[in-house]
């Protein structure tokens, strides 16, 4: 669809005569008839296949024709067509004399014709005017012409219909050749596909408008590249949705069981060394001068009985001092000036000479120690109590006071977490090193089988298009993780471009 436009510029008829040579009375009141038709090697009379148009009286004898396109559209003359422009044409322009006001062909005498020109040739669609001048014996006509496409028609022959739009059917403007030019933020053959936020994950994100990044189930973050861990996951991460991979030092289904009490709570005081010994269980190894489960108690330096051979200990600001009994000397009264002759062994200990009598050694009876058998044996010095148990001397024996969760002579046994039947609704209890685990019967979930649930929401295979189904244990619903190319709560919608429009 397009328009052949003819712009009449000047007509010269100096003598004011008709084609027959007869003069017009009083002058030639001139109007034009235009016939546009298909290409003919020799332009002949016949139907004006591309259209006709007539003008009103434009002037008398010789005159210039005003450009009247702004005020009524009479010049240039418009010859619209509703077909593909063939690129060739024939044009007949007749100048007629109008004796009266009736310009209809049947109202005019046949000899009212002033002049007739006929041209034919090639004409491409375009904005540029072609200027032409046709001269006969008595007249001259100067004019220009062109072919342009109608609104919304494009291409070399005005055959491509294109209407700019910005709605659900497309977001584009039309190029001169009729091809689409997508508006910013849109892509695809018909500019229906939004360009998502730069960096938005191809599989895990999508968008319904430009510069957006909406996450598919199981993903989060500005670019939908962070998986969502299992609901309730405390100290864990994920690499795929709904996982709960525990951080170092944490265990359990929700990574909420503390396996590294030492690091997370630093219970040992005064520079003691902490050792994990189970879930929420630890042992502190105290530095010299400290005691207590958490090495929180400061010992007097004399408490370790550093003075040997019956020497008495005196606390001092910078340490301690041993007052040695007669016959002994040294920092800890460890050197003897005595021999067996001096009966140095107490509590029934037997004396043995050494170094040809220059020294001696005492062999102590049970429950006594020291170089002179002067000390009762402290059965707690070897830290026999495990799992942070506290050692207590009880006369000739010792006992361990255990921390909660442990039992046995040396606190070496875990109290069975399952002994109190913690699993509800018939769940089976399993003792673990770091606590217990309940295996729940169908229809129940939770750490202690306390939550009544429906049967596995994924059992009915609700996800389409080979999507992965995850059961959300906290809500007993399913979540579908869609493969690339599908969206929807069940991955039921394909994402790809729609098939082609027909235009």
């Amino acid at each position: 669809s397009g328009v052949f436009q003819l712009q009449l510029q000047e007509f010269i008829n100096e003598r004011g005569v008709l084609a027959s040579g007869r003069p017009c009375e009083p002058g030639c009141r001139t109007f034009f008839r235009v016939c546009l038709k298909h290409f003919q090697a020799v332009v002949s009379p016949g139907p004006c296949t591309f259209g006709t148009v007539s003008t009103p009286v434009l002037g008398t004898n010789s005159f210039a024709v005003r450009d009247d396109s702004s005020g009524g559209g009479r010049n240039p003359l418009q010859l619209p067509f509703n077909f593909t422009w063939p690129g060739t044409f024939s044009l007949i322009i007749e100048a007629w004399h109008a004796p009266g006001d009736d310009l209809r062909p049947e109202a005019l005498p046949p000899d009212a014709l002033i002049s007739k020109i006929a041209i034919q040739g090639s004409l491409a669609v375009g904005q540029n005017w072609l200027l032409d001048e046709q001269t006969s014996t008595l007249t001259r006509l100067r004019y220009s012409y062109r072919v342009i496409c109608s609104d919304n028609y494009y291409g070399d022959n005005c055959s491509r219909l294109c209407k700019k739009r910005n709605d659900h059917f497309g977001h584009y403007v039309c190029q001169p050749d009729g091809n689409l030019s997508c508006l910013p933020g849109w892509t695809g053959e018909y500019c229906q596909q939004p360009i998502c936020l730069s960096g938005c994950h191809e599989q895990n994100g999508y968008c319904s408008k430009p510069a957006e990044c909406l996450c598919r189930p199981g993903w989060q973050g500005r670019l939908c590249n962070e998986c969502i861990p299992h609901n309730g996951c405390r100290h864990g991460t994920c690499s795929t949705p709904w996982q709960c991979t525990c951080d170092e030092g944490w265990g359990g289904l929700f990574c909420d069981q503390d396996l590294n009490y030492c690091t997370h709570h630093s219970p040992c005081k005064n520079g003691a060394t902490c050792s994990n010994s189970g879930q929420r269980s630890y042992t502190c190894t105290c530095r010299p001068g400290y005691t207590g489960v958490d090495c929180e108690l400061e010992l007097s330096e004399c408490d370790s009985n550093p003075c040997r051979n019956g020497g008495s200990c005196k606390d001092q600001e910078d340490g301690y001092h041993c007052l040695c009994p007669p016959g002994y000397y040294g920092l800890h009264c460890e050197h003897s000036t005595l021999s067996c002759a001096d009966s140095p062994c107490f509590n029934g200990g037997s004396c043995r000479e050494r170094n040809q009598g220059a020294n001696y050694a005492c062999e102590c009876p049970p429950n006594f120690t020291g170089s002179n058998c002067e000390k009762k044996v402290d059965r707690c010095t070897s830290n026999p109590c495990a799992n942070g148990g506290q050692c207590l001397n009880r006369g000739p024996s010792r006992m361990c006071r255990c921390r909660p969760g442990f039992t046995g002579t040396y606190c070496e046994l875990h109290v069975s977490d399952c002994a109190r039947n913690p699993c509800a609704h018939g769940g089976t209890c399993h003792d673990l090193e770091n606590g217990l685990m309940c295996t729940c019967p169908a229809g129940f979930s939770g750490r202690r089988c306390e939550v009544r649930t429906s049967i596995d929401a994924c059992a009915s295979s609700p996800c389409f298009n080979r999507a992965t189904c995850y059961t959300d244990l906290s809500t007993d619903t399913f979540v579908c993780n869609c493969p690339y190319g599908f969206v929807g709560s069940r991955c039921e919608f394909p994402v790809g471009l729609p098939p082609s429009f027909p235009w």
């Epitope: 209407k163 709605d167 659900h168 919608f493 471009l497 729609p498 098939p499 082609s500």
Partner: antibody, heavy 121, light 106 residues
């Protein structure tokens, strides 16, 4: 051959919610080649578009009805539904569901046979 | 809101050409389509995208659209063409229907 069939109550009381379902047979409602819509026609009057939804799950409504209308889809049943709340006698009409095709853009090329809904107490 | 205006009625003699107009602001910049509706029946699409015919629609139905007006032309009108005709276009994701024209074949 794709066919559309509307169903729902023929009588609704004023202030209640009108609910209709369109069942699609002979084609998939989740195909990216189609869009779907509801159109109504009061007795003796012209056609009025209610709303449409698309394969990308975008939904558009007639601005004059937007506050009262909801269109939803159930792909498992190959159905889409219309809910119009707070109805009055002015909502009495034949309600049509229709399909638009990407191959026939900007038009509804297949229509259901329509179902008459009367709003009256 | 966008409006499309149609004449309420048009009459034509059998065999003659019937023209039904639909006017709207810059309608030529949108794609227009036309539906035929006979009493008691659902609408049937007869012209889409200004001037295209769906399969099964007779060649006597044609359309044009430019400026502020779209036209449905039925050449060689037959008695069976007597019906209501509706134009429709989209404006910003909203479908708009004309008020309808009753075509009477005399």
């Amino acid at each position: 051959q794709l066919q559309l069939q509307e169903s729902g109550p023929g009588l609704v009381k004023p202030s209640e919610t009108l609910s209709l379902t369109c069942t699609v047979s002979g084609g998939s409602i989740s195909s990216s080649s189609y869009y779907w819509g509801w159109i109504r026609q009061p007795p003796g009057k012209g056609l009025e578009w209610i709303g449409s939804f698309y394969y990308s799950r975008s939904t558009y409504y007639n601005p004059s009805l937007k506050s009262r209308v909801t269109i939803s889809v159930d792909t498992s049943k190959n159905q889409f539904s219309l809910k119009l709340s707070s109805v009055t006698a002015a909502d009495t009409a034949v309600h049509y569901c229709a399909r638009g095709s990407i191959a026939v853009p900007d038009a509804f090329d297949i229509w259901g046979q329509g179902t008459m809904v009367t709003v009256s107490s | 809101s966008y409006e499309l205006t149609q004449p309420p009625s048009v009459s034509v003699s059998p065999g003659q050409t019937a023209s039904i107009t639909c006017s709207g602001d810059k309608l030529g910049d949108k794609f227009a389509c036309w539906y035929q509706q006979k009493p008691g029946h659902s609408p049937v699409l007869v012209v889409y995208q200004d001037n295209k015919r769906p399969s099964g629609i007779p060649e006597r139905f044609s359309g044009s659209n430019s400026g502020n007006s779209a036209t449905l032309t039925i050449s060689g009108t037959q008695a069976m063409d007597e019906a209501d005709y509706y134009c429709q276009a989209w404006d910003s994701n909203t479908a708009v229907f004309g008020g309808g024209t009753k075509l009477t074949v005399l």
